[in-house]
């Protein structure tokens, strides 16, 4: 599997992973103790035919061209969790692994 | 996890899984021995904010609203393989499990 990495200075128009910091406190999510901020990343860019297609299925649907099927879109194809320390509704401090919080790779699907 | 299922008569505008039969022969993929056709399904529809979002990350990116980030799009969130019998480039008949050929569920990511 392969995906492009870009930054704010990139001129890449194709599907790419960009850096993004999520700041929980800025969202008013003040029940999160740690991390206060984390590197989440996001996907953006164009999905030309076959570029960075994750699944053979994507190619097959494109060929079949059913009614209402949009082209593939730039979306996370590999994600990872982060460990968090947070306050739950019962006033307890909880340690937990929260899945799919970080985009590791972007692709067209 | 939850996803909508629709058919060609549905009036659903939101992200939904639709039936789609892939016909290898119609594509000219004559190296595939079996199956000649299979039920692949596909995803189509709108991703309103928070509807069918697979990842908390999708919500966080929406809140952070970085430059160039499109809204979430309707894409497979669960896929399964199919078993296939096909000719390889060396004219050998191969049996293999091909991953991510069937869409089991659609969601917004």
């Amino acid at each position: 599997d392969f995906g492009l990495d870009c930054d704010e200075h990139s001129t890449e128009s194709r599907c790419c992973r960009y850096p993004l910091t999520v700041d929980f406190e800025a969202f008013g999510w003040d029940w999160i103790i740690a991390p206060k901020r984390y590197k989440a990343n996001y996907c953006s860019g164009e999905c030309e035919f076959v570029f960075l297609q994750k699944y053979p299925h994507t190619h097959l649907v494109h060929q079949a061209n059913p009614r209402g099927s949009a082209g593939p879109c730039c979306t996370p194809t590999k994600m990872s969790p982060i460990n968090m320390l947070y306050f739950n509704g019962k006033e307890q401090i909880i340690y937990g692994k929260i899945p799919a919080m970080v985009v590791d790779r972007c692709g067209c699907s | 996890d939850f996803g909508l299922d629709c058919d060609e008569h549905s009036t659903e505008s939101r992200c939904c899984r639709y039936p789609l039969t892939v016909d290898f022969e119609a594509f000219g993929w004559d190296w595939i021995i079996a199956p000649k056709r299979y039920k692949a399904n596909y995803c189509s529809g709108e991703c309103e904010f928070v509807f069918l979002q697979k990842y908390p990350h999708t919500h966080l990116v929406h809140q952070a609203n970085p430059r160039g980030s499109a809204g979430p799009c309707c894409t497979p969130t669960k896929m399964s393989p199919i078993n296939m019998l096909y000719f390889n480039g060396k004219e050998q008949i191969i049996y293999g499990k091909i991953p991510a050929m069937v869409v089991d569920r659609c969601g917004c990511s």
């Epitope: 103790i33 306050f87 006033e91 401090i93 | -």
Partner: antibody, heavy 117, light 105 residues
Framework: QVQLVQSGAEVKKPGASVKVSCKAS????????MHWVRQAPGQGLEWMGI????????SYAQKFQGRVTMTRDTSTSTVYMELSSLRSEDTAVYYC??????????WGQGTLVTVSS | SYELTQPPSVSVSPGQTATITCSGH??????VSWYQQGSGQSPVLVIY???QRPSGIPGRFSGSNSGNTATLTISGTQAMDEADYFC????????FGGGTKVTVL
């Protein structure tokens, strides 16, 4: 200004317990979590746990679970860290530190706990 | 458990640049803070979120982080910068490096 003042040095025997206090001033005590961090002589820093002074809930580093207890007294704006079943390797300077948005800031002046028979 | 590794010591002449490294697996994917601890003193935060300086911290302190290594740079090092420096990151706990003693020759 924000200040964290800790209790004085302690000498304890192996197997005993120690209770270190940290008195906060210059801010709303119940609005900020408090961490405890220790530093053995000539060593690095080691996070021990965190307490929410508002409700008293805690989370401890795995290494100290079962041996550490963090409590607070809102009437005196003081948090406490009690470590039991002391052994020689618990000899260290123990710090309280306020949980700020950007990190541990500020820190108390530290309390030296010596465990010796 | 996650580990952060620092060199035990770094020496620098006054006015020169001191570079302190902190390495850990995919450390660039995490935010790193740096703490300064003078002899017999409590730690003081000098850098957070890889590159940010808290108010009151001189501009000669800067940070970076990519790949497996975070770096604290002290430009135009002064005698008062002689101290121990600790990197810190969040993984499954608050993790600190072993510390680097900066000596101003």
């Amino acid at each position: 200004q924000v200040q964290l003042v800790q209790s004085g040095a302690e000498v304890k025997k192996p197997g005993a317990s120690v209770k270190v206090s940290c008195k906060a001033s210059g801010y709303t005590f119940t609005s900020y979590y408090m961490h405890w961090v220790r530093q053995a002589p000539g060593q690095g820093l080691e996070w021990m746990g965190i307490i929410n002074p508002s409700g008293g809930s805690t989370s401890y580093a795995q290494k100290f679970q079962g041996r550490v207890t963090m409590t607070r007294d809102t009437s005196t704006s003081t948090v406490y860290m009690e470590l039991s079943s002391l052994r020689s390797e618990d000899t260290a300077v123990y710090y309280c530190a306020r949980d700020e948005n950007w990190g541990f800031d500020p820190w108390g002046q530290g309390t030296l706990v010596t465990v010796s028979s | 458990s996650y580990e952060l590794t620092q060199p035990p010591s770094v020496s620098v002449s006054p006015g020169q640049t001191a570079t302190i490294t902190c390495s850990g697996h995919a450390l660039g994917d995490k935010f790193v803070s740096w703490y300064q601890q003078g002899s017999g003193q409590s730690p003081v935060l000098v850098i957070y979120d890889d590159t940010q300086r808290p108010s009151g911290i001189p501009g000669r302190f800067s940070g970076s982080n990519s790949g497996n290594t975070a770096t604290l740079t002290i430009s135009g090092t002064q005698a008062m910068d002689e101290a121990d420096y600790f990197c810190q990151a969040w993984d499954s706990s608050f993790v600190f490096g072993g510390g680097t003693k900066v000596t101003v020759l």
